[in-house]
């Protein structure tokens, strides 16, 4: 079924939103970001079997062709469908300033 939400691989195995706690050092941002000092990064992780959360017709085709030709056609990838904005306090040449990043945190996920 298109945009199916049943995961045949078992709970938590398929494409879904996960939160990973990361420090500025983990992200390689310590030299230019001042706050937050730790980020709750929401990201899309998991497999994309069958028609699970297929984003569009192209993703459905990709799934079908991957079953037929797994060496040629990769499986769909779990990626953000939309994002939450986040503000960073950062160092610049002219001093400390605010910058909002619209595509920093995943809001929900699909397979594409």
């Amino acid at each position: 079924a298109r945009n199916g939400d049943h995961c045949p691989l078992g709970p938590a195995a398929c494409c879904a939103l996960h939160t990973v706690r990361a420090s500025l050092e983990d992200l390689g941002w310590a030299d230019w970001v001042l706050s937050p000092r730790e980020v709750q990064v929401t990201m899309c992780i998991g497999a994309c079997p069958s028609q699970f959360r297929a984003a569009n017709m192209h993703a459905q085709i990709k799934t079908s062709l991957h079953r037929l030709k797994p060496d040629t056609v990769p499986a769909p990838c779990c990626v953000p469908a939309s994002y939450n904005p986040m503000v960073l306090i950062q160092k610049t040449d002219t001093g400390v300033s605010l910058q909002t990043y619209d595509d920093l945190l995943a809001k929900d996920c699909h397979c594409i």
């Epitope: 001042l34 706050s35 937050p36 939450n84 904005p85 986040m86 503000v87 960073l88 306090i89 400390v96 605010l98 909002t100 920093l104 945190l105």
Partner: antibody, heavy 117, light 106 residues
Framework: QVTLKESGPGILQPSQTLSLTCSFS??????????VGWIRQPSGKGLEWLAN???????YYNSALKSRLTLSKDTSNNQVFLKISSVDTADTATYFC??????????WGQGTLVTIS | QIVLTQSPAIMSASLGEEITLTCSAS?????MHWYQQKSGTSPKVLIY???NLASGVPSRFSGSGSGTFYSLTISSVEAEDAADYYC?????????FGGGTKLEIK
């Protein structure tokens, strides 16, 4: 360009409830890490932090005033509201709202003077 | 709550003089902000997180400190620096401000 503007009743009588509105533009309370804070300043005196409301609707209050303070927000209309119950003359002050980014009062409104008498 | 004590309460300085304002915390804090408030206006940030100059702030301002003792230095005072200066901590709630230092220019 970030702007904030406070509005209030101007003059209020003791024991009444003070209702303040902060109307802002140039940022969104849907943004992670963003909040609005309230600070007051009696004439000729220092700054006193009152409360913060955050993007995720978390609210933090000055413990000395917590029982009298109520914070709320209307994210779609870019407004934050502060109510202070049972006011007395000690609540006479200029009330500021400010954009908070994580831990920083980055931009401030011009303030609104409230007199309790 | 963490009490911030600023000294001196009032400081008078001559043009071109280097001055230092101090802020002492009743408990250790990780960082300190400094705000400037000129007469009849709202405060604006000068120093973010102890030592980082906010955008647009002249380089004659600098901050330092750690633990319970923090300071704001103006390397060469100018007439436009006449204002009230407040330290501010957010290491723990309730967030608190110092009582302020009023800088007057001779």
């Amino acid at each position: 360009q970030v702007t904030l503007k406070e509005s209030g009743p101007g003059i209020l009588q003791p024991s009444q409830t003070l209702s303040l509105t902060c109307s802002f533009s140039g940022f969104s309370l849907n943004t992670h890490g963003m909040g609005v804070g309230w600070i007051r300043q009696p004439s000729g005196k220092g700054l006193e932090w009152l409360a913060n409301i955050w993007w995720n609707d978390d609210k933090y209050y000055n413990s000395a005033l917590k029982s009298r303070l109520t914070l709320s927000k209307d994210t779609s209309n870019n407004q934050v509201f502060l109510k202070i119950s049972s006011v007395d003359t000690a609540d006479t002050a200029t009330y500021f709202c400010a954009q908070v980014a994580w831990d920083w009062f980055a931009y401030w409104g011009q303030g609104t003077l409230v007199t309790i008498s | 709550q963490i009490v911030l004590t600023q000294s001196p309460a009032i400081m008078s300085a001559s043009l071109g003089e280097e001055i230092t304002l101090t802020c002492s915390a009743s408990s250790s804090v990780r960082y300190m902000h400094w705000y400037q408030q000129k007469s009849g206006t709202s405060p604006k940030v000068l120093i973010y997180s102890t030592s980082n100059l906010a955008s647009g702030v002249p380089s004659r301002f600098s901050g330092s400190g750690s633990g319970t003792f923090y300071s704001l230095t103006i390397s060469s005072v100018e007439a436009e620096d006449a204002a009230d200066y407040y330290c501010h901590q957010w290491s723990s709630y309730p967030w608190t401000f110092g009582g302020g230092t009023k800088l007057e220019i001779k």
